[in-house]
Amino acid sequence: QLSRAGRSAPLAAGCPDRCEPARCPPQPEHCEGGRARDACGCCEVCGAPEGAACGLQEGPCGEGLQCVVPFGVPASATVRRRAQAGLCVCASSEPVCGSDANTYANLCQLRAASRRSERLHRPPVIVLQRGACGQGQEDPNSLRHKYNFIADVVEKIAPAVVHIELFRKLPFSKREVPVASGSGFIVSEDGLIVTNAHVVTNKHRVKVELKNGATYEAKIKDVDEKADIALIKIDHQGKLPVLLLGRSSELRPGEFVVAIGSPFSLQNTVTTGIVSTTQRGGKELGLRNSDMDYIQTDAIINYGNSGGPLVNLDGEVIGINTLKVTAGISFAIPSDKIKKFLTESHDRQAKGKAITKKKYIGIRMMSLTSSKAKELKDRHRDFPDVISGAYIIEVIPDTPAEAGGLKENDVIISINGQSVVSANDVSDVIKRESTLNMVVRRGNEDIMITVIPEEIDP
């Protein structure tokens, strides 16, 4: 026994109290308008297709259609009793894209096409997306339209992010094979590109691929190995999209940042996060070579986006993604450091000579704060009990620091009898002194280390 469908609607005249399926008339195998329930809600009948008459004696509309009388009033038992006929109209009025790659004016037309397809023993047509095929859903009031600010940034900056590939020669055949790849970003319309120095390390041919797939041979214009910044150049006719450098000194902890790179041809990789730690002040941003602070972020920086830009929500570059990771933390070279490098590079090329020598010991470090110390202590049980000093992220091989015995994860707490509270203190002493007698906290030991800075070309 079937209970009648649509019990809340007024009963049509002459409907039985109970539905009896045996009394339902046989139905054709295929219905043009799809199936529907009869006026009593007892039997499945062929519904009228879109545009067909409904109400009165014509019967119900098919699936997804409603019976609308002139002036757009939906038909009801009351209307039917007044003996007014309506038309079957699709309840959904927006276009849809079908799996057959056709755009349908509405869902009902797609369903009708699907029924025709099945009748011909072809696959049914299903809905792939709202809106026309090949066209995005552009509803300005949708949440994804309003709140996808990260995607907006990526869309804005992606054309200026490039894929860099390095080639080496085989020793005897001299055939070139790809050896490594990374990312970079365009900083001038005529083709200057910034990347990590480690991306374009020596003895390699460098090829750059733009977002549009165009490839160019690049020339290495300038490299600061210690700061891990390189400037390369491609020859391109016409103007290239560029990224502007923001002020890393104005970054605030908690700011949203986006790390973008181009690890494969024509493809970007995007990670996002916040700034965990910024430099401790404008003065520390002028640090010499690699003895400098980094921007720390929880945006994942990996081989895919190394050399690419770390940007703020305005699409300004606030750092270069660099690979060095300590205790699950990612680092970026601050944009103020990039500006300095670009300015000095410009001067060097304009004057055709090197500027004054710099003193260098060969460490990458960051200022230790109590919160940073706590974070590192949580990650490493044996991290020293210190709340300030210069935390060594990396000791560069074959440098005075390595020769003197400095190690990764050491914390410099004093030099030449003066306490060290930040990375800036270390850089200041390096500039002034020819010998550095350091006290370093390693685990829970204090170790005396002597480092002799070397003079290098900038």
Epitope: R168, L170, P171, F172, S173, R175, V177, P178, V179, A180, T201, N202, K203, H204, P397, D398
Partner: antibody, heavy 123, light 105 residues
Framework: QVQLVQSGAEVKKPGASVKVSCKAS????????MHWVRQAPGQRLEWMGA????????AYNQKFKGRVTITADKSASTAYMELSSLRSEDTAVYYC????????????????WGQGTLVTVSS | DIQMTQSPSSLSASVGDRVTITCSVS?????MYWYQQKPGKAPKLLIY???NLASGVPSRFSGSGSGTDFTFTISSLQPEDIATYYC????????FGQGTKLEIK
Amino acid sequence: QVQLVQSGAEVKKPGASVKVSCKASGYTFTDYEMHWVRQAPGQRLEWMGAIDPETGGTAYNQKFKGRVTITADKSASTAYMELSSLRSEDTAVYYCTREGYSYEGGGYYFDYWGQGTLVTVSS
Amino acid sequence: DIQMTQSPSSLSASVGDRVTITCSVSSSVSYMYWYQQKPGKAPKLLIYDTSNLASGVPSRFSGSGSGTDFTFTISSLQPEDIATYYCQQWSTYPTFGQGTKLEIK
């Protein structure tokens, strides 16, 4: 992981030829040259020659020129070294070894080696 | 051809000792490479580009030098370090030193 697997030991008569195979796996075979190095009992390692598997281009140590032939089958990721006109002093362990490359310095070395194939030349 | 002279040809040392092997070449080379070979086994790369430690190699091994004179050092000899050590250069083509056989006293 990178592996180089060589064919088994051989005993040959003076004047004969020997062909040793080296099956590579775990990397793109055509991106690295394959080299052959031999070691006679109690002697230093001695470079014999190399092949670029992509092009078939070869380079040989002058000492073996005319007697050694190095070939490669790209489809099988296998390199071969054939040494002809064998003499007793060719009794040695023959190694295939992949040319390694230093990204930082641009230098070349041998980073992966086969297990070695002992070739004994005896009448 | 570049001639390579490795010395000593053999040496005996105690566990914990600092061991040094030298390699001289007849004309200047950019880099030196060092290998360890245990009996019946293929050589294993220890040091590349003169001073860089190959992947998975203990830090007690180190290399230094430039031009024509290069040094390989084991800072604290361990029993498993018993082997023959070879230097190798690669200028026009690769050549190896004659080897240094290291034994435990």
